[in-house]
């Protein structure tokens, strides 16, 4: 901690300006009034303070606001935000999206730090839900943000926020997350015509059940292989060869290149070889002709 020393004559800061970069740490502590610093925080960012000097400024703000900084100060923290610990941030009450954007801008281009994660958590909890504008902002800075949330956290995302989600925002989502997001997407994209709806819902189909895939197969949707490969294996397995052919349309030829990968590999093992042969793709590994297929799950249910 910086020792309390009197400010040298004539050095008392009247405003936050460039002259302060020549102040030693103890001079900043002694000569800069914390209340002045708080009201002129917007100027700090334009001045090339050293990290050590920023430490002093942070210390002054901490003394002035032991219960946590007010939003008027937080919004103008700029690079001083990088000096904050998650414990500091937990004391804040950030309600303005502009404040959130200003702080995310400081961290732009970097991985999500613990500070940023805490800030986002505080902000979202304060709002009560992850609304569209917030989601828009967060995915713009961190495209993988949505997929970093647990299924429980995702359950608080209102369907209207789904409009802000871009396909790339879902790239790293696992099936459990898509299970939560898919029904919300259905709710969000209601009352659309078939083709328009499919374009919108396509990115979320990794959470779709078999019944929905069967229904889509009747609509000439021509699903691409990339989407098909992201479908839940348990949802794909019950589909017949005819249904997969209808679902993929002209893209069905791509199955050959994916025959060793899930879910295609597992699906092939469940089909009769005769049926697979009708595709004319040379897919191998189906159930040989003449073999009886026992559905053990059905057998268990009956017993």
């Amino acid at each position: 901690e910086v020792e309390k020393t009197a400010c040298p004559s004539g050095k008392k800061a009247r405003e936050i300006d460039e002259s302060l970069i020549f102040y030693k740490k103890w001079e900043l502590e002694a000569c800069v009034d914390a209340a002045l610093l708080a009201t002129q925080m917007d100027r700090v960012n334009a001045i090339p303070f050293t990290y050590e000097q920023l430490d002093v400024l942070k210390h002054k703000l901490d003394e002035l606001y032991p219960q946590g900084y007010p939003e008027s100060v937080i919004q103008h923290l700029g690079y001083l935000f990088l000096k904050m610990s998650p414990e500091d941030i937990r004391k804040w009450n950030v309600t303005s999206l502009e404040t959130l954007k200003a702080l995310l801008e400081v961290n732009k281009g970097h991985e999500m730090s613990p500070q940023v994660a805490t800030l986002i958590d505080r902000f979202v909890k304060g709002r009560g839900q992850l609304d569209k504008d917030t989601l828009d902002t967060l995915t713009a800075f961190y495209p993988g943000y949505l997929c970093s949330l647990s299924p429980e956290e995702l359950s608080s995302v209102p369907p209207s926020s789904i409009w802000a989600v871009r396909p790339q925002d879902l790239d790293t989502c696992d099936p459990r997350q898509l299970d939560v997001l898919y029904p919300k997407a259905r709710l969000a994209f209601q009352n659309m015509n078939g083709s328009e709806y499919f374009v919108k819902i396509q990115s979320f189909l990794g959470g779709a059940p078999t019944e929905d895939l069967k229904a889509l197969s009747q609509q000439n949707v021509s699903m691409d292989l990339a989407t098909f490969m992201k479908l839940r294996t348990d949802a794909v397995l019950p589909l017949t060869v005819a249904e997969v052919q209808k679902l993929l349309g002209p893209h069905v030829e791509g199955l050959k290149a994916e025959e060793r990968h899930r879910p295609v590999r597992d699906w092939i093992l469940r089909q009769r070889q005769d049926d697979l042969d009708t595709l004319g793709l040379g897919l191998q590994g189906g159930i040989p002709n003449g073999y009886l297929v026992l559905d053990l799950s059905m057998q268990e249910a009956l017993s």
Partner: antibody, heavy 122, light 111 residues
């Protein structure tokens, strides 16, 4: 003819349980999302449970969450509502209602049953 | 939760005249292309029946004297000309998010 018929209502004591059924006919039941909607004695309509066509997704309002469970048996074309820890405020006419499909993606109720009456009283 | 407020609670309209029922949502329930509000009619002793879906689309089999309009938070159901069989209670419902909620109903009486 497209129709849904509810059954299983009756008089039950507070804290008790009841299971409602809804038999569907005249449409491809397994393709449709379904809901239960109730009407209180004061004639207010309240949505109480939703289930997706395959049964994988269910939703409830906070008033019944943890007490009511919606389920379906697509092989039997039947929708269920298991109601536990019943309260006097659950007294209502319970309607089974059809919603949309994965393709005809709508979220209004276009087919309603005649309802089954549930009275919770000591 | 979104609150759907209907007005008036009841109204009496002469045969052949216009009945206007309002429904106000506590927040916007519209996108740029669609409004997620639906209207139902309930005749005495019967279950509700869908009339209008997505604010202005007439359900199949519903007479053209029923019409719906509105967007954002304010929605209207119009019946013109009113007929004897239109006696009953009318409800609005939103499908914007879970939970779906209904208006408290407007009772229509034909004079």
């Amino acid at each position: 003819e497209v129709q849904v018929v509810e059954s299983g209502g009756g008089l039950v004591k507070p804290g008790g349980s009841l299971k409602l059924s809804c038999a569907a006919s005249g449409f491809a039941f397994s393709s449709y999302d379904m809901s239960w909607v109730r009407q209180t004695p004061e004639k207010r309509l309240e949505w109480v449970a939703y289930i997706s066509s395959g049964g994988g997704s269910t939703y409830y309002p906070d008033t019944v969450k943890g007490r009511f469970t919606i389920s379906r048996d697509n092989a039997k074309n039947t929708l269920y509502l298991q109601m536990n820890s019943l309260k006097s405020e659950d007294t209502a006419m319970y309607y089974c209602a059809r919603q949309g499909t994965a393709v005809k993606n709508y979220w209004y109720f276009d087919v309603w049953g005649a309802g089954t009456s549930v009275t919770v009283s000591s | 939760d979104i609150v759907m407020t209907q007005s008036p609670a009841s109204l009496a309209v002469s045969l052949g005249q216009r009945a206007t029922i309002s429904c106000r949502a506590s927040q916007s329930v519209s996108t740029s292309s669609s409004s997620y509000v639906h209207w139902y009619q309930q005749r005495p002793g019967q279950p509700p029946k869908l009339l209008i879906k997505y604010a202005s689309n007439l359900e199949s089999g519903v007479p053209a004297r029923f019409s719906g309009s509105g967007s954002g938070t304010d929605f209207t159901l119009n019946i013109h000309p009113v007929e004897e069989e239109d006696t009953g209670t009318y409800y609005c419902q939103h499908s914007w998010e879970i939970p779906f909620t209904f208006g408290s109903g407007t009772k229509l009486e034909i004079k």
